[in-house]
C-alpha cells in the first residue's frame, strides 16, 4: 500500500436545503482505471461511513440505492455532494481515494472538510 | 476498432444455469466497466450488472441477487455472465454493453428457458 | 430503486416533425443518457451526461433537463428516427431505463 496526498476544503456550510458540496482532489502518482471514494463522518471520536462509489473512465459517480450522495469526476477532482443534512450532522467529512487498478494499490486519505448545517426556523405565521 | 462478441443462443432446462461470455477487443480491457442487459420478448432493458475487469469490482441489480455471477478473465479480455435457477422469465437477449456509456454493445445472445 | 418514466409510451409522427419525448425520475439524478433501438438491433448510444451527442449522432437530436425532468428532442424526424428510444440514469445502482418510448411513422 503506498500514500497519496488528498486534498480536500477544511469548512464548508450547507445549504438551508440540507445540501453540501465539496471537492475531494487527490494527486494520483500514475494512470489510474478504477478508483474508489469512500466519505467517512468523524464526529466524537466515532468514525462512519457517509457513502462510497468505484468509477472508472466515465465522469458520473455511482452510488447504492440508499445513498445520500451524488457526485462527478473530472480528472484527478471529486465533485461530491451530501444531500438530506440535519443539524444533527455537523461534523467532520473525511475524503478517502483508493486506486485500486492497475497496481500499485495506493490510498489517500483528506484532513477532512467540516460541514456545518443549520436547520432551517420554522416559517413564521404570517397574516399574507 | 472497439469490438465485443458474445457466444451464441442457448436453450436451457428450467432450473438450469446458462453462461454467456464476452470477448472485448480494439481496447484495453481493464479499462472500461463491463455492463449486462437483458431484454425480455417485446419489453424494455434491464440491467443485471457490472464488472470492473482490472480488480473484478462487481455490482448486481439486488433482483438478481444469488441468481447471477460475473467473472472476467483478463488474459482473454472476455467477461462472463452466469445465472442460475432459471425459469421462463429469464427467456430474453442478454447483451454485454462497455463502460461508464454503455458505448459498445454487441447483437446479443439470446438465453430461451424452455422445458 | 430510481424509477424512470417515459411520456409518451407511444408516438406517431411524419417525416419532418419535431418531437419530443420526457424522462421523470422519481428521485433527483445527476445526468440522463439517452438510446436508440430498432427492431433486432442491440440499443445504440443517442446523447450522454443530459446534452453530450454520441459520437455519429446527428445534430437534429438535442437533450436537456435537470434534476429530476429530462427531455429528448429530434428537431425534423428523419425516416431512419423511427425507433424506440429508451432514458437511463446512472446515479445511484442499480441503474434503471424509463420503459421506452416508441417513434412509429404517421
Known amino acids: 500500500c503506498k500514500a497519496m496526498h488528498v486534498a480536500q476544503p477544511a469548512v464548508v456550510l450547507a445549504s438551508s436545503r440540507g445540501i453540501a458540496s465539496f471537492v475531494c482532489e487527490y494527486a494520483s502518482p500514475g494512470k489510474a482505471t478504477e478508483v474508489r471514494v469512500t466519505v467517512l463522518r468523524q464526529a466524537d471520536s466515532q468514525v462512519t461511513e457517509v457513502c462510497a462509489a468505484t468509477y472508472m473512465m466515465g465522469n458520473e459517480l455511482t452510488f447504492l440505492d440508499d445513498s445520500i450522495c451524488t457526485g462527478t469526476s473530472s480528472g484527478n477532482q471529486v465533485n461530491l455532494t451530501i444531500q438530506g443534512l440535519r443539524a444533527m450532522d455537523t461534523g467532520l467529512y473525511i475524503c478517502k481515494v483508493e486506486l485500486m487498478y492497475p497496481p500499485p494499490y495506493y490510498l489517500g486519505i483528506g484532513n477532512g472538510t467540516q460541514i456545518y448545517v443549520i436547520d432551517p426556523e420554522p416559517c413564521p405565521d404570517s397574516d399574507f | 476498432q472497439v469490438q465485443l462478441v458474445q457466444s451464441g443462443a442457448e436453450v436451457v432446462k428450467p432450473g438450469a444455469s446458462v453462461k454467456v461470455s464476452c470477448k472485448a477487443s480494439?481496447?484495453?480491457?481493464?479499462s472500461y466497466w463491463i455492463n449486462w442487459i437483458r431484454q425480455a420478448p417485446g419489453q424494455g432493458l434491464e440491467w443485471i450488472g457490472r464488472i470492473a475487469p482490472g480488480s473484478g469490482t462487481t455490482y448486481y441489480n439486488e433482483m438478481f441477487t444469488g441468481r447471477v455471477t460475473l467473472t472476467r478473465d483478463t488474459s482473454t479480455s472476455t467477461a462472463y455472465m452466469e445465472l442460475s435457477s432459471l425459469r421462463s422469465e429469464d427467456t430474453a437477449v442478454y447483451y454485454c454493453?462497455?463502460?461508464?456509456?454503455?458505448?459498445?454493445w454487441d447483437q446479443g445472445t439470446m438465453v430461451t428457458v424452455s422445458s | 430503486d430510481i424509477q424512470l418514466t417515459q411520456s409518451p409510451s407511444f408516438l406517431s409522427a411524419s417525416v419532418g416533425d419535431r418531437v419530443t419525448i420526457t424522462c421523470s425520475a422519481s428521485k433527483s439524478v445527476s445526468y440522463i443518457h439517452w438510446f436508440q433501438q430498432k427492431p433486432g438491433k442491440a440499443p445504440k448510444l443517442l446523447i450522454y451526461d443530459t446534452s453530450t451527442l454520441a459520437s455519429g449522432v446527428p445534430s437534429r437530436f438535442s437533450g436537456s433537463g435537470s434534476g429530476t425532468e429530462y427531455t429528448l428532442t429530434i428537431s425534423s424526424l428523419q425516416p431512419e428516427d423511427f425507433a424506440t428510444y429508451y432514458c437511463q440514469q446512472r446515479t445511484t445502482y442499480p441503474l434503471t431505463f424509463g420503459q421506452g418510448t416508441k417513434l412509429e411513422i404517421k
Open positions: 454493453a462497455r463502460g461508464d456509456y454503455f458505448d459498445y
Open positions: 480494439g481496447y484495453t480491457f481493464t
